[in-house]
């Protein structure tokens, strides 16, 4: 789902306050709710109609610094013979997050947010059929 | 998929550098890749054969302040007649995701990253089966 | 914009053969596939063959198999569907496809007749 611009105001003091000096603002350290643990059924990745693979990107100036990204196994969705049933297609379900990029420079170090497109599956759908003229 | 934990040393400054000052960093304003958006099939939560509804939950003290969640609309899968076959099951495909808490107390205006699960969509699986003693 | 030209239909006695062609333009993606879904009025459409553009695989509905053969020229996105033995329920409307993840792009069709 999509995450909407900021048109930076979220970050901005209240107009009555002096404005937030050489535009960067304090982030305290630590992660509210960060025991927080995806729940899902096992190896649904596996076990789907709509298969899917991870690949991990890794970055150690990013936090997370391990991103997972799905790609879809088949154009089709596998059937209840196993077999591959390409009159049904299996599409990415995709989402925007959040990561904090690190910059630094010597002793100096700063942070930035920065929006990522991860797939985080796939699921089975009917196609939608376009004519063509 | 999963985040993992911060541990702090992300957003430590190397060990040869003075220490954070109290317990804060400097976050930069702007958004990397702001406007990289989802470009997912089009309606594939009604089109799915294990469709879903969308939520959506409001903050004004979280960017971003609308967060959507999914939920499954049926416990079985839509087969090829329209109707409900519960030898398969719909099941939430779940991602963490990172949001910024707002907290202000007068003019101090501080943020802080907190970690929100959100259930994205649903795929159709196979059930393990669980032979009970 | 997905575009789609399709050839070679017609009129055959019952036993004979066809080539139908098809050539597709625009935004094709890794993960697609082109074939060739046929139609009788009033009827539901049927899938006949689709091959897998990168992967190369193929897929024939039980009611043709061993009989018409698909394949593709990847150089300029052409696909061809060779129809041998043909019988009078083989007499459709033709309907090149290409398949994108979630989007089925369908051509206006080439009428194949097949006479007893």
């Known amino acids: 789902r999509k995450i909407p611009k900021v048109g930076h105001t979220f970050f901005q003091k209240p107009e009555s306050c002096p404005p937030v000096p050489g535009g960067s603002m304090k982030l305290d350290i630590g992660i509210i709710n960060e025991n927080q643990r995806v729940s899902m059924s096992r190896n649904i990745e596996s076990r789907s109609t709509s298969p899917w693979n991870y690949t991990v990107t890794w970055d150690p100036n990013r936090y997370p610094s391990e991103v997972v990204q799905a790609q879809c196994r088949n154009l089709g969705c596998i059937n209840a013979q196993g077999k591959e049933d390409i009159s049904m297609n299996s599409v990415p379900i995709q989402q925007e997050t959040l990561v904090v990029r690190r910059k630094h420079q010597g002793c100096s170090v700063s942070f930035q947010l920065e929006k990522v497109l991860v797939t985080v599956g796939c699921t089975c759908v009917t196609p939608v059929i376009h004519h063509v003229q | 998929r999963k985040i993992p934990k911060v541990g702090h040393t992300f957003f430590q400054k190397p060990e040869s550098c003075p220490p954070v000052p109290g317990g804060s960093m400097k976050l930069d304003i702007g958004i990397i890749n702001e406007n990289q958006r989802v470009s997912m099939s089009r309606n594939i939560e009604s089109r799915s054969t294990s469709p879903w509804n969308y939520t959506v939950t409001w903050d004004p003290n979280r960017y971003p302040s609308e967060v959507v969640q999914a939920q499954c609309r049926n416990l079985g899968c839509i087969n090829a007649q329209g109707k409900e076959d519960i030898s398969m099951n719909s099941v939430p495909i779940q991602q963490e995701t990172l949001v910024v808490r707002r907290k202000h107390q007068g003019c101090s205006v501080s943020f802080q990253l907190e970690k929100v699960l959100v259930t994205v969509g649903c795929t159709c699986v196979t059930p393990v089966i669980h032979h009970v003693q | 914009q997905v575009q789609l030209v399709e050839s070679g239909g017609g009129l055959v006695r019952t036993g004979g053969s066809l080539r139908l062609s098809c050539s597709v333009s625009g935004d094709i993606s890794s993960q697609s596939a082109m074939g060739w879904y046929r139609q009788v009025p009033g009827r539901q459409r049927e899938l006949v063959a689709m091959i897998h553009t990168t992967k190369g695989d193929t897929y024939y509905a039980d009611s043709v198999k061993g009989r018409f053969t698909i394949s593709r020229i990847n150089a300029n996105n052409t696909i061809y569907l060779q129809m041998n033995n043909l019988k009078p329920e083989d007499t459709a409307i033709y309907y090149c496809?290409?398949?994108?993840?979630?989007?089925?792009?369908m051509g206006q069709g080439t009428q194949v007749t097949v006479s007893s």
């Open positions: 496809t290409h398949n994108e993840p979630g989007d089925l792009y």
